[in-house]
């Protein structure tokens, strides 16, 4: 079975479906946010270009003990072709800029929605 986004499915999930599910999860996070997301944890900003799924995961994986983004971390791992572990850094990180997880999620969501609308799924 393929497990993407935490859901078991009878076969590979189409990229457009996987991206839609990731977007819906990010929407869910932003809409259900009451207290500061992940206690206001800061993460490295990333360049929203090719390879950004791995870069996003590399940033978010360094946030521990935040259940609100665990599903997002799992879903992002489905878009990243290599294994990502804490402390790993990509050239796509804007290494001099840290932002709150809430802002990171908002920026990522906006970009992913536009990729979905433009049919760019990989």
């Amino acid at each position: 079975l393929t497990c993407l986004g935490g859901f078991a499915s009878p076969g590979p999930v189409p990229p457009s479906t996987a991206l839609r599910e990731l977007i819906e999860e990010l929407v869910n996070i932003t809409q259900n946010q009451k207290a500061p997301l992940c206690n206001g944890s800061m993460v490295w900003s990333i360049n929203l270009t090719a390879g950004m799924y791995c870069a996003a995961l590399e940033s978010l994986i360094n946030v521990s003990g935040c259940s609100a983004i665990e599903k997002t971390q799992r879903m992002l791992s489905g878009f990243c072709p290599h294994k990502v572990s804490a402390g790993q850094f990509s050239s796509l990180h804007v290494r001099d800029t840290k932002i709150e997880v809430a802002q990171f999620v908002k920026d990522l969501l906006l970009h992913l929605k536009k990729l979905f609308r433009e049919g760019q799924f990989n």
Partner: antibody
Framework: EVQLVESGGGLVQPGGSLRLSCAAS????????IHWVRQAPGKGLEWIGR????????KYDPKFQGRFTISADNAKNSLYLQMNSLRAEDTAVYYC?????????????WGQGTLVTVSS | DIQMTQSPSSLSASVGDRVTITCRSS???????????LEWYQQKPGKAPKLLIY???NRFSGVPSRFSGSGSGTDFTLTISSLQPEDFATYYC?????????FGGGTKVEIK
């Protein structure tokens, strides 16, 4: 309140240039796409092109590519349509419109339009 | 480019009539994300267009239930179940699936 207000229309001679503006308020233009649409007198609607102000990704109908240029100024929350080598057939009301902000499925807000008349 | 062909180009009808406008695309307008970005806009003289229907059959907020959309693939329909005086206007279909996006030629609904 979301608003789009076009300006810059007027009378221009054939071969001349004009720059239209679209001032947006009530939302951040970087959060959506902005489109330019025109309508010649008594005719139908024509899509000119659109811009993603977040990254300046611009798409045109090929018939306008080269003569028309879409741009954005995020600091001013404004959009522009630069029109060069104007012809009589470019006479039209020019509208800017935004894609709705959730999934960009449709145009939910339009400006009132600005009339461009190309005539000698 | 995808051509959107509307028919009829104009029609005369009375208040209370059921009105059907069709729109045919020159090729499929199913987007690669699975959505069909087919919209219907209403325009009155001197005014900007207003959205009625999006993604083939979804009524925009505030649009009366007498307006409905249907279709798939390349053939689409806007139906006004019972024409009201404020419905006399020009209607345009629009495809936002493939760039360049394109409008239909319009259908003018006039009073009989």
């Amino acid at each position: 309140e979301v608003q789009l207000v076009e300006s810059g229309g007027g009378l221009v001679q054939p071969g001349g240039s004009l720059r239209l503006s679209c001032a947006a308020s009530g939302f951040n233009i970087k959060d959506t796409y902005i489109h330019w649409v025109r309508q010649a007198p008594g005719k139908g609607l024509e899509w000119i092109g659109r811009i993603d102000p977040a990254n300046d990704n611009i798409k045109y109908d090929p018939k306008f590519q080269g003569r028309f240029t879409i741009s954005a100024d995020n600091a001013k929350n404004s959009l522009y349509l630069q029109m060069n080598s104007l012809r009589a057939e470019d006479t039209a009301v020019y509208y800017c419109a935004r894609s709705e902000e959730n999934w960009y499925d449709f145009f939910d807000y339009w400006g009132q339009g600005t009339l461009v008349t190309v005539s000698s | 480019d995808i051509q959107m062909t509307q028919s009829p180009s104009s029609l005369s009808a009375s208040v209370g009539d059921r009105v059907t406008i069709t729109c045919r695309s020159s090729q499929s307008i199913v987007h690669s994300n699975g959505n069909t970005y087919l919209e219907w806009y209403q325009q009155k003289p001197g005014k900007a267009p207003k959205l009625l229907i999006y993604k083939v059959s979804n009524r925009f907020s505030g649009v009366p239930s007498r307006f409905s959309g249907s279709g798939s693939g390349t053939d689409f329909t806007l139906t006004i179940s019972s024409l009201q005086p404020e419905d006399f206007a020009t209607y345009y279909c629009f495809q936002g699936s493939h760039i360049p996006y394109t409008f239909g030629g319009g259908t003018k609904v006039e009073i009989k």
